[in-house]
């Protein structure tokens, strides 16, 4: 049975040209995390795999940095980066957990709340996502909570 819950940074805003940290945390389960996917709508941004470490999608290499931990840092933000982001935790034996973050990139300093949301993780609750998301075949050691390259 899936007992875990995903906490995320929730709905966040940031200024155009700035950077933002997307964070998720899986708790209340002893399941081993074999891979974490970061996805934006229908695009794969990055993966942190227990065996293979971090891999960033080539089209995002210039603007996406791994971490901190299992999070993802988006840099040089544009208004087009506004939208939904998903962290997909592939775990064994539980299966797949998905967290959702909505990012709004604003033209000016209207993005005053961005940093505040970064300080406190927003409790999102458990969601088992049905489509398009993937567990990796081959993660044996599991990912540490802090993540990073292995």
């Amino acid at each position: 049975m899936m007992t875990g819950t995903i906490e995320t940074t929730g709905n966040i805003s940031a200024e155009k040209g700035g950077s933002i940290i997307l964070q998720c945390h899986l708790s209340s389960t002893t399941a081993q995390v074999t891979q974490v996917n970061w996805e934006q709508q229908d695009q794969l941004l990055a993966i942190c795999n227990a065996d293979l470490g971090w891999h960033i999608s080539p089209s995002f290499k210039d603007r996406v940095a791994p971490g901190p931990g299992l999070g993802l840092t988006l840099q040089s933000l544009t208004v087009n980066d506004t939208g939904e982001y998903f962290c997909i935790y592939h775990t064994y034996p539980d299966g797949t957990y998905t967290g959702r973050i909505f990012l709004e990139v604003l033209e000016s300093s209207v993005a005053e709340h961005g940093a505040r949301f970064q300080e406190n993780l927003y409790f999102q609750g458990l969601e088992h996502h049905h489509h398009h998301h993937h567990h990796h075949h081959g993660g044996s050691g599991g990912l540490p909570e802090t993540g990073g390259d292995r």
Epitope: L44, P93, H136, H137, G138
Partner: antibody
């Protein structure tokens, strides 16, 4: 439309090799793993291995290690399997299948090619 | 011999329900969530019906449902129809282990 188009049927001699291709379209090829599954006449499904273009990672089932080479060409969105030292028991339909979700090999498979019949006969 | 055991055949009449079981016989394919079911008609490629034990891909009829208890996963087909007659394969795909298929179950729709 998401689809996988496989190369045509092959007839091979024992001891030779065969290379089957699987061209993907309708999605971002590099983001999804592609696996190869075969089915001998009247038999069940057998997973042979797969490739994750995103990682350039290849997994091959223990039974086929040393005889199977799985590759992918991202520029043409095509995956390949090559099976060497063919024997009569390798006669089968070879399917390529796409992972349901992004990022790895060995998931449930939601998109399948139509299959390529490989006949090994002297 | 597969590490997943399925009955060779099952049958039912139109409108009835049938259940196909799939038992993991090794630790690698034990009581984890990574189980799926495929339907295959003669001469056709397999079709994914259920994944991660109980989730249906879009486009699959809600007459198909999956469940699991311990090492045994089950596929239940309710309101049986003639077009359901096919072979059904369960699959296990745990991390750090090969994908494994069961030997398949032939479903016959009677009458």
């Amino acid at each position: 439309e998401v689809q996988l188009v496989q190369s045509g049927a092959e007839v091979k001699k024992p001891g030779s090799s065969v290379k089957v291709s699987c061209k993907a379209s309708g999605y971002t090829f590099a983001s999804y793993g592609i696996s190869w599954v075969r089915q001998a006449p009247g038999q069940g499904l057998e997973w042979m291995g797969g490739i994750t273009p995103f990682f350039n990672r290849v997994d091959v089932a223990e039974k086929f290690q040393g005889r199977v080479t799985i590759t992918a060409d991202k520029s043409t969105s095509t995956a390949y399997i090559e099976l060497s030292s063919l024997r009569s028991e390798d006669t089968a339909v070879y399917y390529c299948a796409r992972d349901l979700r992004r990022g790895g090999v060995g998931d449930a498979f939601d998109i399948w090619g139509r299959g390529t019949l490989v006949t090994v006969s002297s | 011999q597969s590490a997943l055991t399925q009955p060779r055949s099952v049958s039912g009449s139109p409108g009835q329900s049938v259940t196909i079981s799939c038992t993991g016989t090794s630790p690698d394919v034990g009581s984890h969530a990574y189980r799926s079911w495929y339907q295959q008609h003669p001469g056709k490629a397999p079709k994914l019906m259920i994944y991660e034990v109980s989730y249906r891909p879009s486009g699959v009829s809600n007459r198909f449902s999956g469940s699991k208890s311990g090492n045994t996963a089950s596929l239940t087909i309710s309101g049986l129809q003639a077009e359901d007659e096919a072979d059904y394969y369960c699959s296990s795909y745990p991390p750090s282990s090969a994908t494994v298929f069961g030997a398949g179950t032939k479903l016959t729709v009677l009458g």
